[in-house]
Interface confidence: medium
């Protein structure tokens, strides 16, 4: 029996709609800053890429530097959008200037999304300096925000990551230091109860110390996160992304109290250089 | 479908001004970074400069001076030339984008001959 | 200002064979690069962008390579309707914070014996 002549149109319909898709120009990337594009030195600051749904890479490429990041930690935003967040960790001056969103969605890459640029203060806490730009973003139709002089900006809120990290490290040792004292102390009053040890069988066995480099590392976020987006270009080979052949690298960052993790779909990767900061990175491929 | 086209080229005399169109149609200039590009009879692609989507306008730095692009609507680029000498004689191509330019008009012959 | 080195200025080469044009920027402009072809009264046509993308249409004879300052276009399998001047140009796009423009490579002839 031969196919109804409607059913027949529609499907012709869809085909000629999904053949105009494809041919279609993909909509430009927008590119926006959290907490804002003025950041006190030392704080974070993630820049969110924004594109439709389908996407497979992002890049925050760097203006002036030809350097780059790209993502495959995709997460949908709404029905019709997808984003990446590329995040510093804590901002310096060397991460000022101008930034911008690509994607890749095959088979083809976007054109770029307009500048955003950073721009990095030194914290000076007075209640009419803000210390960030609230809300920045770029896309396709806009200029970055220029908020700089807005008064009720928020100042930024929390400790700079070096103190928290001070603040963590004296604690533990404080811990550390009380549960020693209530071993010893719970240990002298079994003395006092029981008499001396008969044998060293009955000794109390030490406390043991738990590993707390491995404990942080195990606890801590896998988001794909950009530290201090190192200054090296990643060659990267385009066609291995349309292939799909992305090899996964885990990258661990080991920065004395700052033990993060981030896992990043890295395509062709090349040699993880440590950055100006001294930042070290240890990189495992995993296949 | 979108398209790209420059105006129609002309004879002028050295020293004269001179402005071409790019008439875009199928996308928004909004949207899109949009260049001139320019070839002497004979010889290679010379870029001029680009207007970006946001207004800003770059120039190679012989261009500088002498040549101004701008938005003139939402569906005109043009490119104003002055000071022209003989070494400007060349067909200008009007073309869309950054990293993907795909779109170029037909081109335009521009002749600088007294 | 970016300047872009092509070579070879003209290359010839048999149906079925392989040509290799080179390309190297002056700076590292990481991986904005295109690569067009340009067939006489005509306008040029983009084969490859950001370095090795295929542009949409064009046949994966047409391999873009390279990062940095260093790219290559290799055409294989030649055709006669290859024989055309090809460029490649830097597509960084300028902004206030560079001056790279966007120049293109003097051009290589390829004709097909």
């Known amino acids: 029996m031969s196919p109804h002549p409607t059913a027949l149109l529609g499907l012709v319909l869809c085909l000629a709609q999904t053949i105009h898709t494809q041919e279609e120009d993909l909509p430009r990337p927008s590119i926006s800053a959290e907490p804002g594009t003025v950041i006190p030195l030392g704080s974070h600051v993630t820049f969110v890429c924004r594109g439709p749904v389908g996407v497979q890479t992002f890049r925050l490429e760097r203006d002036s530097r030809s350097t780059y990041n790209d993502t495959e930690d995709v997460s949908q935003a709404s029905p019709s959008e997808s984003e990446a967040r590329f995040r510093i960790d804590s901002v310096r001056e060397g991460n000022a200037g101008l930034y911008r969103c690509i994607y890749y969605k095959p088979p083809k890459w976007s054109e770029q999304s307009d500048y955003l640029e950073l721009l990095v203060k030194e914290s000076s806490g007075g209640p009419d300096s803000p210390d960030t730009e609230p809300g920045s973003s770029a896309g396709p139709t806009q200029r970055p925000s220029d908020n700089s002089h807005n008064e009720h900006a928020p100042a930024s809120q929390g400790l700079k990551a070096e103190h928290l990290y001070i603040l963590i490290g004296v604690s533990v040792v404080f811990l550390f230091c009380l549960l020693l004292l209530v071993l010893f102390c719970l240990h002298r009053q079994n003395q006092i109860k029981q008499g001396p040890p008969r044998s060293k069988d009955e000794e109390q066995k030490p406390q043991q110390r738990p590993d707390l480099a491995v404990d942080v590392l195990e606890r801590t976020a896998d988001k794909a996160t950009v530290n201090g987006l190192p200054e090296k270009d990643r060659e990267t080979d385009t066609s291995a992304l349309a292939a799909g052949s992305s090899q996964e690298v885990t990258y661990a960052q080991l920065d004395h109290w700052a033990l993060t993790q981030r896992t990043a779909r890295a395509v062709s990767p090349q040699s993880t250089k440590p950055m100006a900061e001294s930042i070290t990175y240890a990189a495992v491929a995993r296949h | 479908s979108s398209s790209v086209e420059e105006s129609e080229g002309r004879l002028v005399t050295p020293g004269t001004p001179l402005t071409l169109t790019c008439t875009v149609s199928?996308?928004?200039?909004?949207?899109?970074?949009m260049g001139w590009v320019r070839q002497a009879p004979g010889e290679g692609l010379e870029w001029i400069g680009t207007?970006?989507?946001?207004?800003?306008t770059y120039y190679a730095s012989w261009a500088k001076g002498r040549f101004t692009i701008s938005k003139t609507s939402s569906t005109t680029v043009d490119l104003m030339m002055t000071s022209l000498t003989t070494e400007d004689t060349a067909t200008y191509f009007c073309?869309?984008?950054?990293?993907?330019?795909?779109?170029w008009g037909p081109g335009t012959l521009v002749t600088i001959s007294s | 200002e970016l300047v872009m080195t092509q070579t070879p200025a003209s290359v010839e080469a048999a149906v079925g064979g392989t040509v290799t044009i080179k390309c190297q920027a002056s700076?590292?402009?990481?991986?904005?690069l295109a690569w067009y072809q340009q067939k006489p009264g005509q306008p040029p046509k983009l084969l490859i962008y950001?370095?090795?993308a295929l542009a949409s249409g064009v046949s994966s004879r047409f391999k873009g390579s390279g990062s940095g300052s260093d790219f290559t276009l290799t055409i294989s399998d030649l055709e006669c309707a290859d024989a055309a001047t090809y460029y490649c140009?830097?597509?960084?796009?300028?902004?206030?914070?560079?001056?790279?423009?966007?120049?293109f490579g003097g051009g290589t002839e390829v004709e097909i014996k």
């Open positions: 073309v869309r984008g950054t990293n993907i330019r795909s779109l």
């Open positions: 199928g996308f928004s200039l909004s949207s899109y970074t």
């Open positions: 207007t970006s989507n946001d207004g800003s």
């Open positions: 700076q590292s402009i990481g991986s904005n």
């Open positions: 950001l370095a090795s």
């Open positions: 140009q830097c597509t960084y796009g300028s902004s206030n914070n560079n001056n790279y423009g966007d120049p």
